[in-house]
């Protein structure tokens, strides 16, 4: 089971936020019927990533990758997913 | 289903104190620059988001966790 497959929509939203990609975020939020106030809240989080620059997105991507590939999550997500997320995080 | 450790990370990012959030990230042997960045992002989110914003973010997360896409 790939890590993103454990909850693909969560990782879609997370990487859209961390990437500073508004279009991608809107697209992901539409899939879960987000309300306007919910969209506004997520865009405020996205602003923090954008203001901190690319390294901020990479570093926080590292946090998510590290936690998602930790022993705590290994029951739900198997090791081979680490490489996938690492590529997503660092290949930007 | 989302991994509980990831859910805990996101919950603390929104509702915890900066110290609580950074301590939680530190449990995963994060690099010093990663911890510093985590604190800066947490402080930024706390400054930008009202309590209502955070409630809206949490309700969105509930939608995500209960979605058929999760």
């Amino acid at each position: 089971v790939k890590m993103a497959e454990t909850c693909p929509i969560f990782y879609d939203v997370f990487f859209a936020v961390a990437n500073g990609n508004e279009l991608l975020l809107d697209l992901s939020l539409t899939k879960v019927n987000a309300t306007e106030p919910e969209r506004t809240a997520m865009k405020k989080i996205q602003d923090c990533y954008v203001e901190n620059g690319l390294i901020s997105r990479v570093l926080d991507g590292l946090v998510m990758t590290t936690i998602s590939s930790s022993k705590d999550c290994m029951g739900e997500a198997v090791q081979n997913t680490v490489e996938d997320l690492k590529l997503n995080t660092l290949g930007r | 289903e989302i991994c509980p450790a990831v859910k805990r990370d996101v919950d603390l990012f929104l509702t915890g104190t900066p110290d609580e959030y950074v301590e939680q990230v530190a449990q995963y042997k994060a690099l010093p620059v990663v911890l510093e960045n985590a604190r800066i992002l947490k402080n930024c989110v706390d400054a930008k988001m009202t309590e209502e914003d955070k409630e809206n973010a949490l309700s969105l997360l509930d939608k995500i966790y209960t979605s058929p896409l999760c």
Epitope: N52, L54, I55, T65 | K29, L31, P32, I40
Partner: antibody, heavy 120, light 107 residues
Framework: QVQLQESGPGLVKPSETLSLTCTVS????????WSWIRQPPGKGLEWIGY???????NYNPSLKSRVTISVDTSKNQFSLKLRSVTAADTAVYYC??????????????WGQGTLVTVSS | DIQMTQSPSSLSASVGDRVTITCQAS??????LNWYQQKPGKAPKLLIY???NLETGVPSRFSGSGSGTDFTFTISSLQPEDVATFYC?????????FGQGTKLEIK
């Protein structure tokens, strides 16, 4: 190819301020962390501090009270100021770039170093 | 601060010899350790990152291993151009700290 070049006076008087600049060429200063590291003659390496292009800094506690690192993104430069110098601050000063990945934080590019002597 | 203790401080070996340098951290740093080579009058050069990963373009005779507090750097077959001082560097905690260096000479 990224290149780093330190510049500044090679001789500083005791109690004065040591000022050095690192010019980055062949790449942008943005989106990286940048460090100053020094090496007294015949001795080992000591990390002084780093700066992120946004201006965020972190200093070695042993030097924190005397150090300021700043950045000028328009010139692709970052600078070091070390106040109230003594003979113990005589060293080769290097600037270096951090490369950060999921589990690694290393200095992948270095300047050639500049010797600063503290003497009256 | 995390103290990095490198040994030996100097060593002399013959061309073709296997050379081993150790580095001990005063506390657990996982695998957050790099090795650098510094030739006389030059800036240090990254050889190994993350305790065991060989930097691109670095000859495969160089290798690193270890985790926690004990780390090893090895040159499998010493070459004349390897004359230098080698430093370990921990990045598990701030401030970043270096070992005192190991000066390697050819017999």
């Amino acid at each position: 190819q990224v290149q780093l070049q330190e510049s500044g006076p090679g001789l500083v008087k005791p109690s004065e301020t040591l000022s050095l600049t690192c010019t980055v060429s062949g790449g942008s200063i943005s989106n990286y962390y940048w460090s100053w590291i020094r090496q007294p003659p015949g001795k080992g390496l000591e990390w002084i501090g780093y700066i992120y292009y946004s201006g965020r800094t972190n200093y070695n506690p042993s030097l924190k009270s005397r150090v300021t690192i700043s950045v000028d993104t328009s010139k692709n430069q970052f600078s070091l100021k070390l106040r109230s110098v003594t003979a113990a601050d005589t060293a080769v000063y290097y600037c270096a770039r951090h490369r950060i990945t999921r589990t690694a934080d290393s200095f992948d590019y270095w300047g050639q170093g500049t010797l600063v002597t503290v003497s009256s | 601060d995390i103290q990095m203790t490198q040994s030996p401080s100097s060593l002399s070996a013959s061309v073709g010899d296997r050379v081993t340098i150790t580095c001990q951290a005063s506390q657990d740093i996982t695998n957050y350790l790099n090795w650098y080579q510094q030739k006389p009058g030059k800036a240090p050069k990254l050889l190994i990152y993350d305790a065991s990963n060989l930097e691109t373009g670095v000859p495969s005779r160089f290798s690193g291993s270890g985790s926690g507090t004990d780390f090893t750097f090895t040159i499998s077959s010493l070459q004349p151009e390897d004359v230098a001082t080698f430093y370990c560097h921990q990045y598990g905690d701030l401030p970043y700290t270096f070992g005192q260096g190991t000066k390697l000479e050819i017999k």
